[in-house]
């Protein structure tokens, strides 16, 4: 499997809704026995690795799962929607968080971390990262624009 | 093989402070992980005090925020607790625990060092 | 904070018996996880992210469940099967919370 970022930059004034989307690419066939566990956080550059240091995005952790037969199936998990957030996952692959009414402290570096799970066995984790801009003040745009990544930047980091 | 394995004193008097380290052998401890201090009694069960990240960040119960330090010496391998103004209801088995930052579970735990809080 | 509630408290069952462990949440989290815990020894894990078994855990083990109940289930019940079993959650944070646990005896 793989995990892109169609966008690698969000740059939102206050008060808009912006949904942040990694995209996993799964080429193994259907029937085949892995399970994903998927979270959001937030992160930050480390000087290293991005996305190795993990913060709750509004003091929420989110949890998902799914089986490659089953692949729109989510573990229920605390109400996203009580900290402004919304989860999705759709049978194309697109895992997206979305943030209401964002303001100028959810501005940072995003991660989506998707785990493969084989016969009870963690294989692989890969993450997927952006940056949200929270712009305050007149001068701001009134809508959020996403910018693409660069092609040396579109690949997802994989963590043995 | 990952091992972490507690020490410190078994004998605290009320009002002092409770210190106890955690060495961790096999692994170093900031390459990854939360590295945490959990403790255990009969009335309260099992109690997750607080952890410090491979990075050096810190997190605390709130209930015992006000009174808890954790921290590292990377040049040994290792991380420490200090419990200040102990009472009774601190006596415990305290024992150190690694987790993985998801999905989030205790993988190593340390044997547990029985202290105990009394003049 | 996420209180986590388990029954029973002890549970006294034969040889190849089945075991029923539940693990419920005051409100709805994510994933549940397991440990075992033999008198004088630490916790061991058992079963995490709700149905995933650890290393080294034989299949008789098993979790499910989803939202505020989860259970564990021991298929068919060993001796050394005989212990407290705790279940853990991380999906309100800080703080981490377990359950009471529920002592197992297997004789």
């Known amino acids: 499997i793989k995990v892109t970022t169609p966008y690698s930059l969000y740059v939102c004034p206050e008060g808009q809704n912006v949904t942040l989307t990694c995209r996993i690419l799964d080429s193994v066939s259907k029937g085949h026995d892995a399970n994903f566990l998927k979270t959001w956080f937030l992160s930050s550059r480390g000087e290293v690795q991005v996305c190795k240091e993990h913060r709750p995005i509004r003091n929420f952790i989110s949890h998902h799962q799914h089986h490659r037969s089953h692949p729109a199936v989510n573990a229920s998990h605390d109400q996203p929607q009580k900290h402004g957030l919304e989860i999705a996952y759709d049978n194309h692959g697109n895992f997206s968080i979305t943030l209401h009414n964002v303001t100028l402290s959810d501005s940072g570096l995003y991660c989506c971390l998707v785990i493969e799970v084989k016969h009870h066995h963690p294989e692989r984790r890969l993450y997927g990262y952006m940056e949200l801009q929270v712009q305050t003040g007149k001068g701001s745009a009134s809508t959020c624009t996403a910018y693409p990544p660069n092609e040396q930047d579109s690949d997802s980091i994989t963590a043995a | 093989q990952v091992q972490l394995q507690e020490s410190g004193p078994g004998l605290v008097k009320p009002s002092d402070t409770l210190s106890l380290t955690c060495t961790v052998s096999?692994?170093?401890?900031?390459?990854?992980?939360?590295w945490n201090w959990i403790r255990q009694t009969p009335g309260k069960g099992l109690e997750w005090i607080g952890h410090i990240t491979y990075s050096g960040s810190v997190s605390y119960n709130p209930s015992l925020r006000s009174r808890v330090t954790i921290s590292r010496d990377t040049s040994k391998n290792q991380f420490s607790l200090k419990l200040s103004s102990v009472t009774a209801a601190d006596t415990a088995t305290y024992s150190c625990?690694?987790?993985?930052?998801?999905?989030?579970?205790?993988?190593?735990w340390g044997t547990g060092t029985t202290v105990t809080v009394s003049s | 904070e996420i209180v986590l509630t388990q029954s029973p408290a002890t549970l006294s069952l034969s040889p190849g018996e089945r075991a029923t462990l539940s693990c419920r949440a005051s409100?709805?989290?994510?994933?549940i996880h397991w440990y075992q815990q033999k008198p004088g020894q630490a916790p061991r894990p058992l079963i995490y992210a709700t149905s995933y078994r650890a290393t080294g855990i034989p299949a008789r083990f098993s979790g499910s469940g989803s939202g505020t109940d989860n259970t564990l289930t021991i298929s068919s019940l060993e001796p050394e099967d005989s212990a407290v079993y705790y279940c853990?959650?991380?999906?309100?944070?800080?703080?981490?919370?377990f359950g009471g646990g529920t002592k197992l005896e297997v004789k």
């Open positions: 853990q959650q991380w999906s309100s944070y800080p703080p981490i919370t």
């Open positions: 625990a690694r987790a993985l930052y998801y999905p989030w579970y205790f993988d190593v």
């Open positions: 096999g692994y170093s401890i900031t390459s990854d992980y939360t």
């Open positions: 409100s709805s989290v994510g994933y």
